[in-house]
Interface confidence: medium
């Protein structure tokens, strides 16, 4: 093999190259030196590098590596960030539409209930939004609160409209009676089942996307070890010390170095693959009662059916409640107010099913397909980075970390590096703590995704019957019990054309009792959860 050419006597070439990295500083020797103080670019003869230059090269090499890693993950990162934002906003839009449909149902069918109903509906859907975003709210409590609040109004306005003002002190009793007498039949339980299943899946879907971003962000901002910095310096910069400015590293050598540097990151691969496949499984199961769009946009109809159920049994109920709540204590009636702005367009709500709309469901599947093209992202990283940094083609006339070689031999390179640095040791060190943490988070989300009670294939949720739903409450297929009937009812069959909606300002609905603007209740931690961070002052 040809001996490496000596650097020029004045180290001019090396100096001019180094000046680009570190302008102004005179760290380059004036003439080639023995370089006995060097620790990375161990010379075989005189060198134009100093210890200070070596340190600068190491720093630059690590920065280069970080930039390469960031550019490698840019497309994937953008894909997940964009979709997480799109879905979060789309879910907000679904919630807003569902709220408006429900308000419209009350306005069209039960105008006497509207002031209070709007308020209760608004609170319910605000909680739905917060739940999706991760708030610690119990779905059953949300549904119970909705029906608990609605019943006193239904009783006093629809069933007993002649009730004198003095009788309005029975609210608490009516709230209690609502559950005890099952005045809405099994509709509340049905809604609980549908809403909790669909929201749970929606919430974990968003959680998983956000974790995906966290995974990429973590690996994106990894700080590479000093050992890795030395290997990179040897590969990219030590050739400069010998005046070899135009020579490129050998491709095979680059792969060895990258696998060493990325050993920890590559450990994510197994869990990343599982993450994408588990997410795919989740998405495949997001239909019917596991699809919040389907469930929430049909809620108005189920609520309407539930009120009709009450009206059907009004005679019997009025008698029972008359006895039960005769001696309630005085209690002021809850104040109610009209929202300023309902944004209800009856024409829009009457729209029939529109074919070929882009639905949330198709968007989810599209995302999964794109994500699957990144399933080998972590295992392929070393190769990707080498292919996107300068390496010699065909491993001919290239730099192997010590010298210029005609052909790269991994064995020779390893032998030559033994006394400098052990690649095997680097691999054995295990992943960085941040990588271990992100692996733990991936394991956790994968477990959550796997354990979600999702429908396997097209199985009807007949177990709802076992939970005590009366067949008369809905149609034959309980989990499709969403699009109720009733004269003058609005049929909502079409899925949201949510992408068109995204341009629509989410905060337009900001009227009292109708507000979907997230207030800081989505700060989903409480003081008493925080106490884990410090000694617990709880009594």
């Amino acid at each position: 093999q040809p001996p490496p050419p000596p650097p020029d006597a004045t180290c001019h070439q090396v100096r001019s190259f180094f000046q680009r990295l570190q302008p102004g500083l005179k760290w380059v020797p004036e003439t080639p030196v023995p370089g006995s103080d060097l620790q990375v670019c161990l010379p075989k003869g005189p060198t134009c590098c100093s210890r200070k230059m070596e340190e600068k090269y190491q720093l630059t090499a690590r920065l280069n590596m970080e930039q390469l890693l960031q550019s490698a993950s840019m497309e994937l990162k953008f894909l997940i960030i964009q979709n997480a934002a799109v879905f979060q906003e789309a879910f907000e839009i679904v919630v807003r539409h569902a709220k408006n449909y429900t308000n419209a149902m009350f306005k069209n069918n039960y105008p006497s209930l509207t002031p209070q109903a709007f308020e209760f509906v608004g609170e319910f859907f605000t909680d739905v939004s917060l739940y999706i975003l991760g708030s610690d709210i119990n779905v059953d409590d949300m549904v119970n609160e909705l029906f608990d609040s609605l019943f006193p109004v239904i009783y006093t306005q629809l069933m007993n409209p002649g009730l004198p003002d003095s009788a309005l002190d029975i609210n608490e009793c009516l709230r209690g009676a609502r559950r005890d007498l099952k005045v809405f039949g099994n509709f509340p339980k049905l809604i609980m089942t549908q809403v909790s299943k669909s929201l749970q899946v929606t919430r974990i879907f968003l959680q998983a996307l956000n974790l995906g971003i966290e995974v990429i962000n973590t690996t994106d901002h990894l700080k590479f070890s000093k050992d890795c910095g030395r290997m990179l310096t040897r590969m990219w910069y030590c050739s400069y010390c010998q005046g070899l400015m135009m020579v490129k590293p050998c491709g095979g050598y680059c792969n060895v170095v990258m696998q060493g540097c990325m050993a920890g990151v590559v450990e994510i691969d197994k869990y990343w693959r599982e993450y994408i496949l588990s997410l795919e499984e989740l998405v495949n199961g997001m239909y019917r009662i596991y699809d919040m769009e389907n469930v929430l946009l049909g809620l108005f109809s189920t609520i309407h059916d539930s009120i009709q159920y009450v009206q059907k049994n009004a005679g019997k109920l009025t008698t029972t409640i008359g006895k039960l709540c005769a001696h309630s204590q005085q209690r002021q009636y809850r104040s109610a107010y009209y929202p300023e702005d309902l944004f209800i367009d009856k024409k829009v709500l009457k729209v029939a099913h529109v074919e070929h709309e882009e639905t949330l469901s198709s968007r989810r599947r599209e995302l999964i397909q794109k994500l699957k093209s990144f399933i080998s992202f972590y295992s392929a990283l070393p190769g990707y980075i080498c292919s996107h940094s300068p390496v010699a083609e065909n491993d001919t006339l290239c730099w192997n970390g010590q010298e210029l070689v005609e052909r790269y031999s991994q064995k020779a390179a390893r032998n030559g590096m033994k006394n400098q640095f052990n690649l095997h040791e680097l691999k054995m060190k295990g992943p960085e703590p941040v990588v271990s943490q992100i692996i733990d988070k991936l394991k956790h989300i994968n477990q959550l995704l796997r354990t979600m009670s999702m429908p396997k294939g097209r199985v009807l949720d007949k177990n709802l019957d076992e939970e005590g739903f009366e067949s008369g409450d809905c149609g034959d297929d309980e989990d499709e019990c969403i699009g109720g009937s009733g004269d003058g009812m609005i049929k909502v069959k079409n899925q949201l054309r949510f992408l068109a909606e995204l341009a629509y300002d989410l905060d337009v609905d900001d009227a009292p009792g109708n507000s979907q603007q997230a207030t800081p209740k989505d700060n989903e931690i409480s003081t008493f959860h925080n106490l884990g961070n410090v000694h617990s002052p709880l009594k």
């Epitope: 989505d522 931690i525 003081t527 961070n533």
Partner: antibody, heavy 115, light 112 residues
Framework: QVQLQQSGTELVRPGASVKLSCKAL????????MHWVKQTPVHGLEWIGA????????AYNQRFKGKATLTADKSSSTAYMEYSSLTSEDSAVYYC????????WGQGTLVTVSA | DVVMTQTPLSLPVSLGDQASISCRSS???????????LQWYLQKPGQSPKLLIY???NRFSGVPDRFSGRGSGTDFTLKISRVEAEDLGVYFC?????????FGGGTKLEIK
């Protein structure tokens, strides 16, 4: 809408105790923590502690432990802070504020400790 | 306790100017759930503090869009793009992640 109504100004003697009240309106009292904050020109805003009216759980700043006692009455949707062994250092405006993020505050109660 | 350091103490501005207030915490305010619990408030003389921004950058309802918050970990900034007369008062930052919760010392925004 959400409102927190605090009791009026208090002028008290050193060594005495005072019980401040904070009535919650416009939301479900038991769903949110109520926090108390002290404000003086010297120390600025200081977090005293919090109570969860639903569970009765309390958390205190060590600096105010033994000085402040937080309670809540669910039936009247009112939170209370009893402040004992008063000294001139305790002259301040005391606020109740609803977690999360302290989006809603009472109007404040001025306590003046003077012989 | 987590110390919240606000700078400057006083900020004289002309109406229509941009104002920027800094808040630094002695520990990272990132919770294990990924959220950063840093709030900004405005207190006008004789009034209670009013929430402007929560979780670093989220504007509370009714807060004009000239108010914006940014930052991460331990360094945070509140910006007012065009100061109006109604914006004058004392601005506080606070953290609600470590008990005891703590507030910054305040920055007084006043007319030059």
């Amino acid at each position: 809408q959400v409102q927190l109504q605090q009791s009026g100004t208090e002028l008290v003697r050193p060594g005495a105790s005072v019980k401040l009240s904070c009535k919650a309106l416009g939301y479900t009292f038991t769903d949110y923590e109520m926090h108390w904050v002290k404000q003086t020109p010297v120390h600025g805003l200081e977090w005293i502690g919090a109570i969860h009216p639903g569970s009765g759980d309390t958390a205190y700043n060590q600096r105010f432990k033994g000085k402040a006692t937080l309670t809540a009455d669910k039936s009247s949707s009112t939170a209370y802070m009893e402040y004992s062994s008063l000294t001139s250092e305790d002259s301040a405006v005391y606020y109740c504020t609803r977690f999360y993020s302290y989006a809603y505050w009472g109007q404040g109660t001025l306590v003046t400790v003077s012989a | 306790d987590v110390v919240m350091t606000q700078t400057p103490l006083s900020l004289p501005v002309s109406l229509g100017d941009q104002a920027s207030i800094s808040c630094r915490s002695s520990q990272s305010l990132v919770h294990s759930n990924g959220n950063t619990y840093l709030q900004w408030y405005l207190q006008k003389p004789g009034q209670s503090p009013k929430l402007l921004i929560y979780k670093v950058s989220n504007r509370f309802s009714g807060v004009p869009d000239r108010f914006s918050g940014r930052g991460s970990g331990t360094d945070f900034t509140l910006k007012i793009s065009r100061v109006e007369a109604e914006d004058l008062g004392v601005y506080f930052c606070s953290q609600s992640i470590y008990v005891p919760y703590t507030f910054g010392g305040g920055t007084k925004l006043e007319i030059k």
